[in-house]
């Protein structure tokens, strides 16, 4: 009932709680002397469903049959309307429409850990929309029945707060859940299980790893488990991997040897436990243990390349370069590289340890036969040395690869292609493609990149250390025994017109012609490989088209003669530079007047 109902009553038949689809009779009746004061025939009783008027009647009582009520709670209010006054609330009633509970399904129980508590879950089925009480019962082998009730609206879980013991792990327990509301009751099918079926062990803890004699091949994983655990599964992976290695072990007693770990690798380890071969469930995975395996001596050999530079008639500079070993080859932190330089005929050898660099430069006589060996060392030992005989890499003209081309291939890639040398192509043992940023000064500090290609390949895609809008000097070497031939080309992955033209720094007169000198365009403004320079000139104050002279770009060139100027005429000169994408803006303008005699 909604309020004190002093003036009358609202009764509901058959009940305030009804099954969906049922009909109810609602009666509103006034108590004696509670009608309209002047004329009781004027009593007008009105029945509201929530705020909507659904029926009215003149007199002391009103009967209304109501059908089609929705699931949930519906509020009915009866009011009295008298002439010349507001409606007065008489009484009200709530009607609860719902359904009987469905049979609870999929009842299952679990105990987390040997010391945990038994809890069960089930599926309620469709919502009853009514207050429904669930009672969970558990009968055990000790002739005790446990019972717990739940009065939440959405009850599908109960914890008994007790702990099943493994005194007789094969003894049966039976659980059953019963749902009861005003419209009926329903019980689940009984669920019968043993201790071993429902106990889910706690995840293992205190995980440790030991490496005997600091060796990756003698590795044991240790952990602690609950007392009854029979099975474990281990999973482990390198920290940078998504794929797990899995191992199942029986009666491990908290230890297991791992035989397939890689050296100098951080691994993540996790363990899970189970009480029985085919009963029960696996525990959650343990917290991860992260550990790094010990180093082993490096495997593999360094990829070594070199560059020779003529210094003077008796000396040459040798620059050695090598690539880092891959992580799987280094098998530890590389502490230093050992470089040995030896003159083969005289047997003189010099060894040096290099730390922090992957290159080494030295000066040697131009005479003699020289060889180098380079190896990488970590705390456990050294890699096998890579041996190279120093030779003149471009000496054999007949070994020079032909028709070398370099073309942009997508973002920051250059496809280099060539034809085999004229000399017997089968003599080629390997090709080496080398590239470095083009610097007009021929700076030897510029990093060198290279890749090796099999003798039957006639192309290579270079992508390492390739930047857009930078010109690269690319060489293809064909190597055969102690001979080599090479061809070179310039290439870029992406280009556009240069950002500026060359800066003319001097114009000098020589025997009736002039020599123009300029400063190179800064590398970052070249925007790719330069193909040509253009020198423009025209008479000062003239509106005629300028004349021009186009010069093929050569790295070291920074002057050029022009002999078509008239004496005693003042000219304005400027320069531009071109890539395959177009021409730069003008460089600076210079005026010049040739002093020589007129022809």
């Amino acid at each position: 009932k909604i309020d004190a109902c002093k003036r009358g009553d609202v009764t509901v038949k058959p009940s305030h709680v009804i099954l969906l689809g049922s009909t109810v009779n609602i009666t509103c009746s006034l108590k004696p002397r509670q009608g309209c004061f002047h004329y009781s025939r004027r009593n007008k009783l009105i029945l509201y469903k929530f705020d909507r008027r659904i029926n009215f009647h003149h007199g002391h009582s009103l009967n209304s049959q109501v059908t089609g009520l929705p699931l949930g709670t519906t509020l009915f209010v009866c009011k009295l309307a008298c002439i010349n006054s507001d409606e007065i609330q008489i009484c009200g009633a709530e009607i609860f429409v719902g359904v009987a509970p469905e049979q609870p399904q999929n009842l299952s129980c679990i105990q987390k850990g040997e010391q945990g508590t038994v809890a069960c879950t089930w599926e309620r089925g469709r919502d009853t929309h009514l207050y429904t009480e669930y009672t969970l019962q558990l009968s055990g082998p000790k002739n005790l029945t446990w019972q717990k009730q739940c009065k939440d609206i959405y009850c599908d879980y109960l914890d008994f707060g007790i702990n099943l013991t493994p005194e007789s792990p094969e003894s049966n327990f039976t659980a059953k859940v019963t749902a009861v509301n005003s419209l009926g009751s329903s019980s689940s099918l009984p669920s019968t299980f043993t201790f071993l079926d429902i106990v889910r062990p706690l995840p293992p803890w205190d995980i440790r790893i030991k490496f005997q004699k600091a060796s990756v091949s003698r590795c044991t994983l240790y952990w602690r488990d609950e007392g009854l655990v029979l099975l474990n599964r281990l999973r482990y992976r390198p920290s940078n991997s998504r794929l797990w290695n899995m191992v199942n072990v029986t009666k491990a007693k908290g230890r297991h040897d791992l035989l397939d770990l890689k050296p100098f690798t951080e691994y993540e380890f996790q363990i899970s436990s189970k009480l029985h071969l085919y009963k029960g469930s696996w525990s959650d995975w343990s917290e991860s243990l992260r550990a790094q395996t010990p180093e082993e001596e490096p495997t593999g050999m360094l990829d070594v390349w070199y560059m020779k530079r003529h210094i003077d008639y008796s000396r040459q500079q040798i620059s050695l370069f090598w690539k880092n070993l891959s992580v799987s080859e280094a098998r530890g932190k590389i502490l230093h590289y050992q470089v040995t330089l030896q003159e083969l005929t005289g047997g003189k050898a010099m060894t040096q340890n290099i730390t922090g660099h992957t290159s080494w430069t030295t000066v040697i006589p131009r005479t003699g036969n020289w060889a180098v060996a380079v190896s990488a060392a970590n705390s456990k030992g050294s890699s096998l040395p890579t041996r190279i005989n120093i030779m003149n890499l471009c000496e054999a003209g007949l070994l020079a690869p032909r028709q070398v081309s370099a073309n942009s291939e997508g973002m920051d890639n250059i496809l280099v292609t060539w034809q085999p040398p004229r000399k017997d192509p089968s003599a080629v043992q390997e090709y080496v493609v080398e590239w470095r940023e083009l610097h007009p000064g021929g700076d030897t500090q510029v990093p060198l990149n290279w890749l090796r290609s099999r003798p039957y390949n006639v192309s290579a895609l270079i992508s390492e250390n390739i930047k857009s809008y930078i010109c690269y000097e690319i060489r293809v070497y064909a190597l055969s025994g102690d001979q080599g031939g090479c061809s070179s080309i310039l290439g870029n992955s992406k280009h556009k017109a240069p950002l500026s033209g060359p800066h003319i720094n001097a114009i000098t007169e020589e025997k009736g012609s002039i020599l123009i000198s300029w400063n190179s365009i800064p590398v970052q403004e070249q925007m790719g490989c330069l193909l040509h320079y253009r020198i423009y000139w025209k008479e000062r104050d003239s509106n005629s088209q300028p004349q021009l002279c186009e010069i093929p770009y050569r790295v070291s060139q920074n002057s050029h003669p022009i002999n078509s100027l008239q004496p005693r005429v003042t000219y304005v000169l400027w320069m531009t530079a071109l890539t395959a994408a177009g021409e730069s803006s003008h460089g600076n303008e210079r005026e010049f007047c040739l002093q020589g005699k007129a022809n």
Epitope: G116, L144, K148, D159, G161, I162, N163, L164
Partner: nanobody
Framework: QVQLQESGGGLVQAGGSLRLSCAAS????????MAWFRQAPGKEREIVAG????????YISDYMKGRFSIDRGNAENTVYLQMDSLKPEDTAVYSC??????????????????????WGQGTQVTVSS
């Protein structure tokens, strides 16, 4: 020290009912569990029923299931044992027991009298045929 006081025992005819009550001198919330045990002459003490105070889990011997029930009623420090359809073999001294604090008890522990640490004097129930 928790004192437990049983009442409600007596003589009853077979098929009759009794309601035993156990009043604790401390609030029952301070206790982990309260239970009823019985001991017939010449027999061992056996569990009848109990209740875990915090979660409201009840436990009852399968021999008495359907005839006996345990509840806390409305009184904060009292538990009741409702006994219906009594039989002559239900004749025994009925004692109230309490466990003040605990970790999670096991199903075995909770049915054993030694697990409980406070006991009442007991009340006699006699069922005549």
């Amino acid at each position: 020290q928790v004192q437990l006081q049983e009442s409600g025992g007596g003589l009853v005819q077979a098929g009759g009912s009794l309601r035993l009550s156990c009043a604790a001198s401390a609030r029952t919330e301070s206790m982990y569990a309260m239970a009823w045990f019985r001991q017939a002459p010449g027999k061992e003490r056996e569990i009848v029923a109990g209740i875990i105070q915090s979660g409201g889990t009840t436990y009852i011997s399968d021999y008495m299931k359907g005839r006996f029930s345990i509840d806390r009623g409305n009184a904060e420090n009292t538990v009741y044992l409702q006994m219906d359809s009594l039989k002559p073999e239900d004749t025994a001294v009925y004692s109230c027991a309490a466990k003040v604090s605990s970790g999670t008890p096991s199903d075995i522990q909770i049915s054993q009298s030694r697990w409980y640490d406070h006991w009442g004097q007991g009340t006699q129930v006699t069922v005549s045929s």
